[in-house]
């Protein structure tokens, strides 16, 4: 799903207040709901009819440093007999997410939000046949 | 997928530098890759064998203000005849994502990262059979 454009109004102070100095704002240390847990069914990436593998990308100047991307294993979907059904298609489910980019020059450290497109998993679909002449 | 705990080291300055004052840091305005596009306007939520609906939550003090959550429509999966196959299960695919929480008291505005659990879509899986002896 798509993150709407920020328009930067979200990060501005009310009009009656003095503007933010130097085009930056104050970000408090600590993360709300940091201990929240994901309760995804076990091994769904292998048990799905549209199975996928995971690839981990690592960047020490990004939070989270580890971003996991899914890749569908097949073009078709896996049927009850374990064979590939090519009349159906395994398609990626994608999600825009925010990460924090760290920028530093010596002891001057600043941070910036960055949009990242993550493939979270795959699902099996019936293609809509709209042939363009 | 799970975002690892921050440990807050990511947001700290190098040890040789003076500490961050007041437990906050500088966040630059603007978002990297803001114009990146998601090519998801294809109604896969209706054409999946594990279809889902979307619910939008809105919070003006969160960026993005709009967070979309998916809910699987069925317990089973939809077969080629359009009927529900209860020998298979529709399960949610979840992703931890970051949002920015805005906190203000008068003209003093600060921001804090928040972890949010988003259900991005659903996939069809073969249930794990636990045989009880």
């Amino acid at each position: 799903r798509k993150i709407p454009k920020v328009g930067h109004t979200f990060f501005q102070k009310p009009e009656s207040c003095p503007p933010v100095p130097g085009g930056s704002m104050k970000l408090d240390i600590g993360i709300i709901n940091e201990n929240q847990r994901v309760s995804m069914s076990r091994n769904i990436e292998s048990r799905s009819t549209s199975p996928w593998n995971y690839t981990v990308t690592w960047d020490p100047n990004r939070y989270p440093s580890e971003v996991v991307q899914a890749q569908c294993r097949n073009l078709g979907c896996i049927n009850a007999q374990g064979a590939e059904d090519i009349s159906m298609n395994s398609v990626p489910i994608q999600q825009e997410t925010l990460v924090v980019r760290r920028k530093h020059q010596g002891c001057s450290v600043s941070f910036q939000l960055e949009k990242v497109l993550v493939t979270v998993g795959c699902t099996c679909v019936t293609p809509v046949i709209h042939h363009v002449q | 997928r799970k975002i690892p705990k921050v440990g807050h080291t990511f947001f700290q300055k190098p040890e040789s530098c003076p500490p961050v004052p007041g437990g906050s840091m500088k966040l630059d305005i603007g978002i990297i890759n803001e114009n990146q596009r998601v090519s998801m306007s294809r109604n896969i939520e209706s054409r999946s064998t594990s279809p889902w609906n979307y619910t939008v939550t809105w919070d003006p003090n969160r960026y993005p203000s709009e967070v979309v959550q998916a809910q699987c429509r069925n317990l089973g999966c939809i077969n080629a005849q359009g009927a529900e196959d209860i020998s298979m299960n529709s399960v949610p695919i979840q992703q931890e994502t970051l949002v920015v929480r805005r906190k203000h008291q008068g003209c003093s505005v600060s921001f804090q990262l928040e972890k949010v659990l988003v259900t991005v879509g659903c996939t069809c899986v073969t249930p794990v059979i636990h045989h009880v002896q």
């Epitope: 899914a70 569908c72 294993r73 009349s87 298609n89 990626p92 493939t119 046949i129 709209h130 | 294809r42």
Partner: antibody, heavy 123, light 106 residues
Amino acid sequence: EVQLQQSGPELVKPGASVKISCKTSGYTFNEYTMHWVKQSHGKRLEWIGGINPNSGGVSYNQNFKGKATLTVDKSSSTASMELRSLTSEDSAVFYCARGGDGYYTNYFDIDYWGQGTSVTVSS
Amino acid sequence: QIVLTQSPAIMSASPGEKVTMSCSASSSVNYMHWFQQKSGTSPKRWIYDTSKLASGVPARFSGSGSGTSYSLTITDMEAEDAATYYCQQWNSHPLTFGAGTKLELI
């Protein structure tokens, strides 16, 4: 205009490997599947496999598993196929062919073809 | 895998003549697709989803059939129609092609 430009003819020795490429233009490479098809001396067409750059998904004909490896380079909008442990049976014309996007057309719905790459295996 | 058997293997026709070639599948398929190939060139998409003509294909061509039996028909043969025609299915893995029907001009 959709175009699939394949690499030139190859003469290779038995036991060797060869990698042939298919450079695309005129459409968004990531959004469509690329298939590879073998045609031995003007005869029957045999589907080797297909790969989708967006989903990462691949599908192979069992007859070519271990023989062919399909890859894509999104940055150059190029699909490639490597053939290994070549024998005289592998001498053929190999075509890349564009399939569907998986959303509006099936991944296996082939519409455009490259001009073909001739591979000759001979000592 | 689904085997597609095309008949006849070779046929000849005069200009203006009606031509019909067939494609028989070893198991039922939902759709059949056809490609045209002329000597020394790559195949071209010709008929898809059993009966839909690809862009630029003359209206004298038509496709029909269901289940295991499909056909391609040319109402009045023209010189430019001389080529090999291949049927193809992607109902079942792996995708397969027929051996082709070579249509020659008399």
